[in-house]
């Protein structure tokens, strides 16, 4: 066989580490630097054996799906991205990953990618609110951040509930505390409102703005400032993969090419 | 639609140089590994050199090794063959075609004589 | 390398006829992955080849289904049933089971 002028690019699999909460999609990206006219891709987890365990598999503009349907390879539109995506993902889902690639004839060759790992966490955080699930990747510390941020809220609402009461049972020892907000001057909201700090790519929105117009309320002459925690629930920005699902082919393929241009 | 485009064929002495060049259209270039094949004065086909997608890789024919080099531009969507010490014998049409392996299309063709 | 040899000629054929145009490799081209690595293209007079059969059995897009392909690991056939006019021309086998990709030396089909 002529070997070529130079040696193959390596097949990349990021992210490098992942980690999502149970019942949450992990999913990584498998890379080809080059596209040959045919070959096969395999993702893989590694054994605690060291030996790799095939989840999945693309070939020839098939997709082979494994033992288990939740795990699912899908082609991207570029050719030569793939996404490896794991489906609600499990507890005992964390692991060491790759994906493999083999060329077939005439290049005939075997390539690894470097191994990436997923931690799947337990779900700790569930706002009776939220309708979309909350994003993966919450670092440790990130997870203390919620926590606190969570307790503080409580604190503000029962303070908020005890000066209400107060106010209620005792209405004169009000009578003199200002009314935050007139009608000559409405609290602010709209464009003058506070910057929006969005943290994307699967990580937790803070979104610091001022309180909303309410009823007048008795309060303070200070104006408290509220931190809402936001999941984010909208279409995917730039940051953020797109659901691998969601990814449409542009044109048919041209199956005597071989795999080398659309997804399936 | 697919079309391929050869151009630089010409009449050049034994031990000279050309350039080709493959100008692509109709499916996205840089997803496809790309082939020269040579046919020779007696129609027997010959591959000359293929070259990968990202150009990581490239294949060459022993008969053209050392003196032949394949190249693309896939921002110009354009395929190379850079032909030096030509001997008579490479005297043919060349042809770009689409694939490593499987030359699912093929160009019209260039044609290079090489003769005293 | 690979060598790939080719009768030159068929026996001219009579239009509406089928013709077997034979291959042979000295190398089996039957890879593990159970494909077998053999291309068959036609070159019409005056034309660039054209892609009929790839991986031994299937018709590229766009080819006549009186057009198929056969054979075992080193041992290939393409068969044309009901041949037409514009059937004419060279028909070539390549391998592609490993570099240098080789073609045969085409077959010329000719019509009585």
């Known amino acids: 066989l002529d070997s070529p002028d130079r040696p193959w690019s390596p097949l990349t699999f990021s992210p490098a580490q992942l980690t999502v909460q149970e019942g949450e999609n992990a999913t990584f990206t498998c890379s080809l630097a080059d596209i040959p006219d045919s070959f096969v891709l395999n993702w893989y987890r590694l054994s605690p054996r060291n030996q790799t365990d095939k989840l999945a598999a693309f070939q020839e503009d098939r997709i082979e799906p494994g033992r288990d349907r939740r795990f699912r390879v899908t082609r991207l539109p570029n050719g030569r991205d793939f996404h490896m995506s794991i489906v609600a993902a499990r507890l005992n889902d964390s692991g060491i990953y790759l994906c493999g690639a083999i060329y077939l004839p005439p290049n005939t060759q075997i390539n690894e990618s470097p191994r990436a790992e997923l931690s799947v966490t337990e779900r700790t955080l569930e706002p009776p609110t939220q309708s979309p699930s909350p994003p993966p990747r919450l670092s440790g510390q990130l997870q203390g951040l919620v926590i606190g941020v969570t307790s503080v809220l409580v604190g503000v609402l029962l303070l908020l509930l005890l000066t209400w009461v107060l106010a209620a049972v005792f209405p004169r020892a009000t009578r003199g505390a200002c009314v935050c907000g007139s009608e000559d001057e409405p609290l602010k909201e709209g464009p003058d409102a506070a910057p929006v700090f969005t943290l994307d790519y699967g990580e937790l929105d803070f979104q610091w703005r001022e309180k909303t117009p309410e009823p007048p309320a008795p309060c303070a002459p200070e104006q408290t400032e509220y931190a809402t925690i936001v999941f984010p629930g909208r279409p995917a920005s730039p940051g953020r993969r797109a659901s691998a699902s969601s990814l449409q082919g542009a044109q048919p393929p041209s199956p005597e090419d071989g795999p080398g241009l659309w997804p399936p | 639609e697919v079309q391929l485009v050869e151009s630089g064929g010409d009449l050049v002495k034994p031990g000279g140089s050309l350039k080709l060049s493959c100008v692509a259209s109709?499916?996205?270039?840089?997803?496809?590994?790309m082939s020269w094949v040579r046919q020779t004065p007696d129609k027997r086909l010959e591959w000359v050199a293929t070259?990968?997608?990202?150009?990581?890789?490239?294949y060459y024919s022993d008969s053209v090794k050392g003196r032949f080099t394949i190249s693309r531009d896939n921002a110009k969507n354009t395929l190379f063959l850079q032909m030096n010490s030509l001997k008579s014998e490479d005297t043919a049409i060349f042809y770009c075609?689409?694939?490593?392996?499987?030359?699912?299309?093929w160009g019209q063709g260039t044609l290079v004589t090489v003769s005293a | 390398d690979v060598v790939i040899t080719q009768d030159e000629l068929s026996n001219p054929v009579t239009s509406g006829e089928s013709v077997s145009i034979s291959c042979r490799s000295n190398?089996?081209?039957?890879?593990?992955?159970?494909?077998?690595?053999l291309n068959w293209f036609l070159q019409r007079p005056g034309q660039s080849p054209q892609l009929l059969i790839y991986?031994?059995?299937t018709r590229a897009s766009g080819v006549s289904d009186r057009f198929s392909g056969s054979g075992s690991g080193t041992d290939f056939t393409l068969e044309i049933s009901e041949v037409r006019a514009e059937d004419v021309g060279v028909y070539y086998c390549?391998?592609?089971?490993?570099?240098?990709?080789?073609f045969g030396a085409g077959t010329k089909l000719e019509l009585k």
């Open positions: 070259i990968s997608s990202g150009s990581s890789y490239s």
């Open positions: 390549q391998q592609l089971i490993e570099y240098p990709l080789t």
């Open positions: 190398k089996s081209l039957l890879y593990e992955d159970g494909q077998t690595y």
């Open positions: 109709g499916f996205p270039f840089s997803n496809f590994g």
């Open positions: 075609a689409r694939g490593e392996s499987r030359f699912a299309y």
């Open positions: 991986l031994m059995s």
